[in-house]
């Protein structure tokens, strides 16, 4: 289960949001929810343009 990069962190460093891969962090509800509830970008066919580049950390953001 991917929970984001792990590293040694300073005491004041931000912690990653621990959402499982099928979930995204709801910034307003302040907890993880199904990504489909948040209008996160749908996967597109290869070659299709997307509205904004998405990183591998998508569910955590």
């Amino acid at each position: 289960m991917r929970r984001g990069p792990r590293s040694l962190r300073g005491r004041d460093a931000p912690a990653p949001t621990p959402c499982v891969p099928a979930e995204c962090f709801d910034l307003l509800a302040r907890h993880c929810v199904a990504c489909g509830l948040l209008r996160t970008p749908r996967p597109k066919p290869a070659g299709a343009s997307s509205p904004a580049p998405r990183t591998a950390l998508q569910p955590q953001e």
């Epitope: 931000p14 995204c24 910034l27 509830l37 948040l38 209008r39 996160t40 970008p41 509205p51 998508q58």
Partner: antibody
Framework: DVQLQESGPSLVKPSQTLSLTCSVT????????WNWIRKFPGNKLEYMGY???????YYNPSLKSRISITRDTSKNQFYLQLLSVTTEDTATYYC????????????WGAGTLVTVSS | DIVMTQTPLSLPVSLGDQASISCRSS???????????LHWYLQKPGQSPKLLIY???NRFSGVPDRFSGSGSGTDFTLKISRVEAEDLGVYFC??????????FGSGTKLEIK
């Protein structure tokens, strides 16, 4: 493509209720956060509130208890009501959808100018 | 609420010039998840606002590379390297870190000198 369109009266009398509809096509309002934002003459943008995928709402405290946002999922529309309007509520009203990954307003209606005047 | 202070309010430029708009927030916009949710919008005359830059420095799809965003914490800048006629309008910064409510800068009107 997701498209939003505001509709409602362009002229409202002081003390009356401003009522606007936002019609959404290309996406379901049972997903995401759906918002009302207004722009005053002179360019100030004010965030008014949202209705969420679950139907929960948030209202900007600056609007006190004058505001209500509701929805009709069968029509894929959400609504703004602003009670007891004054001339200070004259503005262009926008509905907008929120990107749920980077949290910007990714889709906006064209806006509707509402003038409060007797 | 987070106050977003934008300067200048009006920015007269000549076509081809560089333009720079500043946005300062009343608190750090670094979220506890490490992201900085500072965005820039452009509202052209007669249109609704459109996203230009998201998360400080990422250009939205279709936005020309003459637009760039930078900054961190509480101080952010939008630069247009060579202003074109189609760039005229009102630019707004906005924060989505400490929400709700979402808050906007007061707007900078880019106009021809």
């Amino acid at each position: 493509d997701v498209q939003l369109q505001e509709s409602g009266p362009s002229l409202v009398k002081p003390s009356q209720t401003l009522s606007l509809t936002c019609s959404v096509t290309g996406d379901s309002i049972t997903s995401g956060y759906w918002n009302w934002i207004r722009k005053f003459p002179g360019n100030k943008l004010e965030y008014m509130g949202y209705i969420s995928y679950s139907g929960s709402t948030y209202y900007n405290p600056s609007l006190k208890s004058r505001i209500s946002i509701t929805r009709d999922t069968s029509k894929n529309q959400f609504y703004l009501q602003l009670l007891s309007v004054t001339t200070e509520d004259t503005a262009t009203y926008y509905c907008a959808g929120l990107d749920g990954l980077y949290w910007y307003f990714d889709v906006w209606g064209a806006g509707t100018l509402v003038t409060v005047s007797s | 609420d987070i106050v977003m202070t934008q300067t200048p309010l009006s920015l007269p430029v000549s076509l081809g010039d560089q333009a720079s708009i500043s946005c300062r927030s009343s608190q750090s916009l670094v979220h506890s998840n490490g992201n900085t949710y500072l965005h820039w919008y452009l509202q052209k005359p007669g249109q609704s606002p459109k996203l230009l830059i998201y998360k400080v420095s990422n250009r939205f799809s279709g936005v020309p590379d003459r637009f760039s965003g930078s900054g961190s914490g509480t101080d952010f800048t939008l630069k247009i390297s060579r202003v074109e006629a189609e760039d005229l309008g009102v630019y707004f910064c906005s924060q989505s870190t400490h929400v709700p409510p979402f808050t906007f800068g007061s707007g900078t009107k880019l106009e021809i000198k």
